[in-house]
Amino acid sequence: QAGPLPKPTLWAEPGSVISWGNSVTIWCQGTLEAREYRLDKEESPAPWDRQNPLEPKNKARFSIPSMTEDYAGRYRCYYRSPVGWSQPSDPLELVMTGAYSKPTLSALPSPLVTSGKSVTLLCQSRSPMDTFLLIKERAAHPLLHLRSEHGAQQHQAEFPMSPVTSVHGGTYRCFSSHGFSHYLLSHPSDPLELIVSGSLEDPRPSPTRSVSTAAGPEDQPLMPTGSVPHSGLRRHWE
């Protein structure tokens, strides 16, 4: 008796983070013995799609001509050979940006910071959100990922950095998201350039606790002008 069929490889081109309205192609690569490929989407009736293999039969293409909210989510693929169905691929998380208006990103007290001092990056959203992502350009993964502990909707999240070193310098953007689908992100904020001056060196950034603040009511400032002393957001390293 032969062992289980090897799991296929699943990936997306041009990538797994796609702006609303853009096209994306999902590829599933199995073996030359594959007769059929199946793509499943989490929380959708299975199979989400089926495709015949492309020659030389070791992969199949699943096309999304225009990215919308419906396509965002977690996918796995399988292939069928004469001896049966393969193991599922590792999951592919397809994320859509542009689901909400862009947040605004600020550096407090200033984007010009001396090495060894503290700076806080503040990401503020127009509508209440429960997840905020801080991205550094040319970094492989989100630098920080703040999520509300109790589903509390917040208008902002603070990303404190202390002590600041030259490692912190660079261009940052932030995104916001709702808990009901972390596969749907806002447009990215405008970029923020953090400039670190001075020569104090520290090998690793060490963000401290995060703080979130709810927006004021109507006829008050549209964004908060102070901050609540406790955190409603939980920090995750990614």
Epitope: W20, E69, Y100, S101, Q124, S127, L222, T225
Partner: antibody, heavy 117, light 113 residues
Framework: EVQLVQSGAEVKKPGASVKVSCKAS????????IDWVKQPPGKGLEWIGY????????SYNQKFKGRATMTVDKSTSTVYMELSSLRSEDTAVYYC??????????WGQGTTVTVSS | DIVMTQSPDSLAVSLGERATINCKSS????????????LAWYQQKPGQPPKLLIY???TRESGVPDRFSGSGSGTDFTLTISSLQAEDVAVYYC?????????FGQGTKLEIK
């Protein structure tokens, strides 16, 4: 390409109501607030209120509260503004506009409403 | 309500010259939470809707020519067109988004001298 396309011009009698539509395309409709702004002939801009298509949340300028009603049809990506008890000073161009962060990055072409007996 | 007052009401400037429009708010638009000024500038040409030029008092909207710039903080703001072009003839509005209701200045009509 983001587009907000509004319904055509209307002529109404005093005391009547008018319902103006604004059909959105080219972006994720549910996640962006849509506001309405009034511009009387030869005059400036006045904010009426907003609706958030995701959950139907609305907020109105006190000046228009009780007369302006905003609704949304998510199936057609369309928002509506109904203005009741029309009077001559309601003669204006009405714009829908997409909110970016309380400011407006895209505007509809405008709908002229004329109130005349 | 925050009252926005623009000056002058109208302005005539020669092609290639600098145009300056001022906007004053009845209270500060500078937020202590993020050190940003909640002010936008729009351009409106005859028969067209307004077009966003500047937000956060000084951030130029994508696609807006760099001859347009915004400055100021607190209650006093300025829109500057560094070298006036024929296509810049329009009415310009400032808008505060610090508090509800959102309010606009009365507009400044810019013409060519």
């Amino acid at each position: 390409e983001v587009q907000l396309v509004q319904s055509g011009a209307e002529v109404k009698k005093p005391g009547a109501s008018v319902k103006v539509s604004c059909k959105a395309s080219g972006y994720s409709f549910s996640g962006f607030y849509i506001d309405w702004v009034k511009q009387p002939p030869g005059k400036g801009l006045e904010w009426i209120g907003y609706i958030f298509p995701s959950n139907g949340e609305t907020s109105y300028n006190q000046k228009f509260k009780g007369r302006a009603t905003m609704t949304v049809d998510k199936s057609t990506s369309t928002v509506y503004m109904e203005l009741s008890s029309l009077r001559s000073e309601d003669t204006a161009v009405y714009y829908c506009a997409r909110q970016a962060f309380y400011y407006f990055d895209y505007w509809g072409q405008g709908t002229t409403v004329t109130v005349s007996s | 309500d925050i009252v926005m007052t623009q000056s002058p009401d109208s302005l005539a400037v020669s092609l290639g010259e600098r145009a300056t429009i001022n906007c004053k708010s009845s209270q500060s638009l500078l937020s202590s939470s993020n050190q940003k000024n909640y002010l936008a500038w729009y351009q409106q040409k005859p028969g067209q809707p307004p077009k966003l030029l500047i937000y956060w008092a000084s951030t130029r909207e994508s696609g807006v020519p760099d001859r347009f710039s915004g400055s100021g903080s607190g209650t006093d703001f300025t829109l500057t067109i560094s070298s006036l072009q024929a296509e810049d003839v329009a009415v310009y509005y400032c808008q505060q988004y610090y508090s509800y209701p959102l309010t606009f200045g009365q507009g400044t009509k810019l013409e060519i001298k």
